[in-house]
C-alpha cells in the first residue's frame, strides 16, 4: 500500500503530526494529488545533486499538468484552481532553486515514514510501544466492545434462566411436599396408588429437568467466567497498559494521552457484570439449600465458581486504581515527576470502577518509598517524608466528568536528616538525580461483603533539593520513560539501558513540540546526532549510552550534550518562542551545512542558529557578505545569551543590527532571512513601533523627549575578515579591536561581537543610515 494511503488510516494524534509537516512551501494537496509519483522519486538524491533536482522539478511540473488535464475531464473546478495556484507558486519559488523543494519533499517523506514506523511499532508491541495506531486500536476496541456486550447479554440470559430454575424448583418443592403429605394420608387410608405413581413420575421428570437446568447454568457460569477473564485480560494487560505507556510518553513531552473515560466505562461495565454474576452464584447456594440431591452440580462446582468470581473482581478493582495525573510541581507543568523538596506538588488518583455507592467511602493515604525502606538504606538513597494533606477521600464531585477520584494539591517532600547529611550511607552508588523514588497510594474497599486492599504508585520520581538539579533530573525522567514501561524499577540507573538514536531523536523533538508549536526537523536532528555520535551518514539504530547523553562532556567542551541542549530549550521557551514557532530559527545546523547553503545566496542573506560553544544557551546569526575583492564571506556574530536577551528582544536585535565599516558608516548586513524572506516581513511584527516606545512626554518640559533606540553594532575593518570576536569597548574606543578570544566559536568567516548603543534620534538626524 502506498505510504500516503497508510498515513490516512492513522489515529488523529498522528494525523495532527502529519499536518504539521506540511505548509505552503510544500502544500498537502500536492502530496495528495501526486502521491504515487512523489513516492517513486529519489528526492534525497535530488536534494544533493542540482542537475537531478532540476530534472525532478521539471518532471513534477509535468505531472501537475497531467493531473490538471484529468481534473479538466472530470470538470473538477476547485481542484483545477488549486493545482494551477500550486504550479504558479512552485515555479515562482523553486524554479531557480530546485534542490530546495527536493530537500523539503525528502524531509516530509522521511518524517512520514518515521510516523508510520512509530505507529507500526506500537501496534506490534501492543502497549510496550509509544502509541498504537488508530486502525489497529479501533478494530481492537470494537472487538472489546463486542466481548463486553456479549458478557452483559450472557449475564442477562443467566438471570432469566435462574428465574426459570427458581420457579421450577418452587413447583417441585410444592409438589413434593404435597405428595409427601398425601402419601402420609394414603398410608392411613390406602388410597389410589396409581395417582401417586403418576405424581412420582411427574416429580422425577421435574427433578430431571431441574438437574439439567442446574448443570446448564453451572456450565454457562464457568464459560461466562472464562469470557470475563479474557475481557479483563484485554482491558488490564492491553488497554490499560497502553494507556499507562501513553501516559509515560505524554509525561516526557510526547503526544497527549487519551482520556480515561472510555476505559472507565468498560471496566465499570465489567465490574457490574461480575457483581451480578457473583449474586447469581450466591443464588445457586440458596437453591441448593432448598433442594439438593445426589450428584447435585451446584454442590460440586459452586465453591470453585465463587472463588473465581471473587478473584476476578478483586483483581479488576486492583487494576482499576490508577494514578491519573502523575506527581508534578505546578510551577513546572511540562516537567512532571521531578519534585523539589519543600515545594508543593500535585497528583491525582482515580478508581476506574465508577460505583456511586463508593462515593466518599474510600480514604486514600499517600506515602513515599513504602516498600524500599531497608533497601533504600542499603543502597544509600536519601529518605523522605510526605508533608501536607496526605489523606484524601475519593469522591465524584471534584472532577468535572464525575469520575471517582482524589486529587492531592498540597503535598511536599522533606528529607529525613541522617547523621551524614541526609544520605543514609556515605558510599551511595547513585547521584541524587539518578535516585528514583515511588509515591504510593493506598486504600481499602469494603463492598458486598468483600474487603479489597488497593494500592497503586506513581511512575518513579526524582527528588531534587535545588532547582539547578532540574536539568539532570529531567534527563533521568526522559531516559527512564523512553526506555522502559516497567512502572517501578527504582534500580534503573544502577545499570542504565542503552537507547538508540531513533528513540532519542523522537524524545528530543518532543522537548520542543510539547512546549512550542514546532518539533525538530530531520536536518536539525541530524545535526544533533552528529554532536552526539560524530560524523556519519545514517544514524538510525546507532546506540547512545546514558553517560554520553547526559554525563560525559562533549568533545572539546566543558559540558554535556544534555546540559547544552536543555539550556537551548530554556532559551527558546523564554526568549525566542515566537520566532521558533514561525520556523525562522534554523537552530541546529553544522558549520559545513551552514556554509553550503549560504554560499550560494546573495549578500545579506542570514540564518539564525544556536551557539555550539555556549553552555548557558546562546543564539546567533550568520550572514553572507562580499569583501572588497568580491569574494563571498560567511560571518557570525558572537552568540546572544539569556542575559542579553533579557534587555532586548532578539527580533529587535536583528532589526537594528549594524556593522560599522572603516568610514564609520553604519550598515545593516542582515537583509533576507534564509532562504529569501525580507527581514522586515519576518521580524517587523515582533518589534514595538517607535511611537509606542515613549508614549508620554514630561508635561513640565517645553519640548518632548528625544526618542532613543537601542541597536547592536559590530565595529569592523573594510575587509570584514576579523577572525576573533572583540571584547565590548566604550564608544570612544570603538575602533580599537580587542583580542579576547574567550568563548569564541570558530567560524567559517569572521565572528563579530556586537556593541549596544542607545542612539538619540531627532528629526534632524534622519540622515543617519538606520
Amino acid at each position: 500500500m502506498a505510504q500516503w494511503n497508510q498515513l490516512q488510516q492513522l489515529d488523529t494524534r498522528y494525523l495532527e503530526q502529519l499536518h504539521q509537516l506540511y505548509s505552503d512551501s510544500f502544500p498537502m494537496e500536492l502530496r495528495q494529488f501526486l502521491a504515487p509519483w512523489i513516492e517513486s522519486q529519489d528526492w534525497a538524491y535530488a536534494a544533493s545533486k542540482e542537475s537531478h533536482a532540476t530534472l525532478v522539478f521539471h518532471n513534477l511540473l509535468g505531472e501537475i499538468d497531467q493531473q490538471y488535464s484529468r481534473f479538466l475531464q472530470e470538470s473538477n473546478v476547485l481542484y483545477q484552481h488549486n493545482l494551477r495556484r500550486i504550479k504558479q507558486f512552485l515555479q515562482s519559488r523553486y524554479l531557480e532553486k530546485p534542490m530546495e523543494i527536493a530537500r523539503i519533499v525528502a524531509r516530509c517523506l522521511w518524517e512520514e515514514s518515521r510516523l508510520l514506523q512509530t505507529a507500526a511499532t506500537a501496534a506490534q508491541q501492543g502497549g510496550q510501544a509509544n502509541h498504537p495506531t488508530a486502525a489497529v486500536v479501533t478494530e481492537k476496541q470494537q472487538m472489546l466492545e463486542q466481548h463486553l456486550q456479549d458478557v452483559r447479554k450472557r449475564v442477562q440470559d443467566l438471570e432469566q434462566k435462574m428465574k426459570v430454575v427458581e420457579n421450577l424448583q418452587d413447583d417441585f418443592d410444592f409438589n413434593y411436599k404435597t405428595l409427601k403429605s398425601q402419601g402420609d394420608m394414603q398410608d392411613l387410608n390406602g388410597n389410589n396408588q396409581s395417582v401417586t405413581r403418576q405424581k412420582m413420575q411427574q416429580l422425577e421428570q421435574m427433578l430431571t429437568a431441574l438437574d439439567q437446568m442446574r448443570r446448564s447454568i453451572v456450565s454457562e457460569l464457568a464459560g461466562l467466567l472464562s469470557a470475563m477473564e479474557y475481557v479483563q485480560k484485554t482491558l488490564t494487560d492491553e488497554e490499560l497498559a497502553d494507556w499507562k505507556r501513553r501516559q509515560q510518553i505524554a509525561c516526557i513531552g510526547g503526544p497527549p494521552n487519551i482520556c480515561l473515560d472510555r476505559l472507565e466505562n468498560w471496566i465499570t461495565s465489567l465490574a457490574e457484570s461480575q457483581l451480578q454474576t457473583r449474586q447469581q452464584i450466591k443464588k445457586l447456594e440458596e437453591l441448593q439449600q432448598k433442594v439438593s440431591y445426589k450428584g447435585d452440580p451446584i454442590v460440586q462446582h459452586r465453591p470453585m465458581l465463587e472463588e473465581r468470581i471473587v478473584e476476578l473482581f478483586r483483581n479488576l478493582m486492583k487494576s482499576a486504581f490508577v494514578v491519573e495525573r502523575q506527581p508534578c510541581m505546578p510551577m513546572h507543568p511540562d516537567r512532571p515527576l521531578v519534585i523539589k523538596t519543600g515545594v508543593q506538588f500535585t497528583t491525582k488518583v482515580r478508581l476506574l470502577v465508577k460505583f456511586p455507592e463508593l462515593n466518599y467511602q474510600l480514604k486514600i493515604k499517600v506515602c513515599i518509598d513504602k516498600d524500599s525502606g531497608d533497601v533504600a538504606a542499603l543502597r544509600g538513597s536519601r529518605k523522605f517524608n510526605i508533608l501536607g494533606t496526605n489523606t484524601k477521600v475519593m469522591n465524584m464531585e471534584e472532577s468535572n466528568n464525575g469520575s471517582l477520584s482524589a486529587e492531592f494539591k498540597h503535598l511536599t517532600l522533606r528529607e529525613q536528616r541522617c547523621g551524614n547529611g541526609g544520605r543514609a550511607n556515605c558510599d551511595a552508588s547513585l547521584i541524587v538525580t539518578e535516585e528514583l523514588h515511588l509515591i504510593t497510594f493506598e486504600t481499602e474497599v469494603y463492598h458486598q461483603g468483600l474487603k479489597i486492599d488497593l494500592e497503586t504508585h506513581s511512575l518513579p520520581v526524582v527528588v531534587i533539593s535545588n532547582i539547578c538539579q532540574m536539568p539532570n533530573a529531567w534527563a533521568s525522567i526522559l531516559w527512564y520513560n523512553m526506555l522502559t514501561n516497567n512502572p517501578k524499577n527504582v534500580n534503573f540507573f544502577t545499570k542504565p539501558p542503552i537507547g538508540t538514536w531513533d528513540q532519542v531523536a523522537e524524545v528530543l523533538s518532543w522537548q520542543f513540540s510539547s512546549t512550542t508549536k514546532r518539533g525538530l526537523s530531520i536536518e536539525q536532528l541530524t545535526t544533533l546526532a552528529e554532536k552526539l555520535l560524530g560524523p556519519g551518514v545514517n544514524y538510525s539504530g546507532c546506540q547512545i549510552t546514558w553517560a554520553k547523553f547526559c554525563k560525559e562532556n562533549m568533545a572539546g567542551k566543558g559540558f554535556s550534550f544534555w546540559v547544552w541542549l536543555d539550556n537551548i530549550i530554556d532559551l527558546v521557551k523564554k526568549y525566542i518562542l515566537a520566532l521558533w514557532n514561525e520556523g525562522y530559527i534554523m537552530g541546529f545546523i553544522s558549520k559545513e551545512r551552514e556554509r553550503a547553503i549560504l554560499s550560494t545566496k546573495p549578500p545579506g542573506t542570514f540564518l539564525l542558529r544556536f551557539s555550539e560553544s555556549s553552555k548557558e544557551g546562546g543564539v546567533t546569526f550568520t550572514w553572507v557578505e562580499k569583501d572588497i575583492s568580491g569574494k563571498t564571506q560567511i560571518q557570525s556574530v558572537e552568540p546572544y545569551t539569556k542575559q542579553q536577551l533579557n534587555n532586548m528582544s532578539f527580533a529587535e536585535i536583528i532589526m537594528g543590527y549594524k556593522i560599522m565599516d572603516a568610514t564609520n558608516i553604519l550598515v545593516s548586513p542582515l537583509v533576507y532571512l534564509y532562504p529569501d524572506i525580507p527581514k522586515e516581513e519576518a521580524f517587523g511584527k515582533y518589534c514595538r513601533p517607535e511611537s509606542q516606545e515613549h508614549p508620554e512626554a514630561d508635561p513640565g518640559s517645553a519640548a518632548p523627549y528625544l526618542k532613543t533606540k537601542f541597536i547592536c553594532v559590530t565595529p569592523t575593518t573594510c575587509s570584514n575578515t576579523i577572525d576573533l570576536p572583540m571584547s565590548p569597548r566604550t564608544l570612544d574606543s570603538l575602533m580599537q579591536f580587542g583580542n579576547n578570544g574567550e568563548g569564541a566559536e570558530p567560524s567559517a568567516g569572521g565572528q563579530f561581537e556586537s556593541l549596544t548603543f542607545d542612539m538619540e534620534l531627532t528629526s534632524e538626524c534622519a540622515t543617519s543610515p538606520m
Partner: nanobody, 127 residues
Framework: HVQLVESGGGSVQAGGSLRLSCAAS????????IGWFRQVPGKEREGVSV????????YYADSVKGRFTISQDNTKNTLYLQMNSLKPEDTAMYYC????????????????????WGQGTQVTVSS
C-alpha cells in the same frame, strides 16, 4: 416476555396434510430449544418434535418420524410443523413451546424444561 401464537390447525381426512405455524415475539434466539407438543384430553402432554434455535438439532418422537418435519424461519421468528400422512391418532391440541436452555437429549421432550407456551391450535384427523 416471550409470546407464542400457534395457527394452521383444522380438520383433515386421514392421509391429508397440515402446516402449523408458531409466531414468536420477544423471543431471544440465544442458546435455546423450540418444540411442538400435543395433548389429548385426560392424558399427559407429549413431545412431538424439537429444534435448536440454530437449527442444528432436530428431533422427532417415534410416532411421527418420517411423516412430520420441523423447520423455522429466523427472519420471521416463526416455527413450522409440516404434518403429512396424518392419522386419526394425531388428533390433539398442538402447542408450541420454547426453553431458555439448550436442547439436551435427555430432556428434549421434558415439558418442565420449557418455560414459555402458546395457547395451542386444534388438529382433528378423521378416518
Amino acid at each position: 416476555h416471550v409470546q407464542l401464537v400457534e395457527s394452521g390447525g383444522g380438520s383433515v381426512q386421514a392421509g391429508g396434510s397440515l402446516r402449523l405455524s408458531c409466531a414468536a415475539s420477544g423471543f431471544n434466539s440465544g442458546d435455546s430449544c423450540i418444540g411442538w407438543f400435543r395433548q389429548v384430553p385426560g392424558k399427559e402432554r407429549e413431545g412431538v418434535s424439537v429444534i435448536s434455535s440454530g437449527g442444528e438439532i432436530r428431533y422427532y418422537a417415534d410416532s411421527v418420524k418420517g411423516r412430520f418435519t420441523i423447520s423455522q424461519d429466523n427472519t420471521k421468528n416463526t416455527l413450522y410443523l409440516q404434518m403429512n400422512s396424518l392419522k386419526p391418532e394425531d388428533t390433539a391440541m398442538y402447542y408450541c413451546a420454547t426453553s431458555v436452555f439448550l436442547c439436551y437429549p435427555r430432556t428434549w421432550f421434558n415439558r418442565y424444561m420449557y418455560n414459555s407456551w402458546g395457547q395451542g391450535t386444534q388438529v382433528t384427523v378423521s378416518s
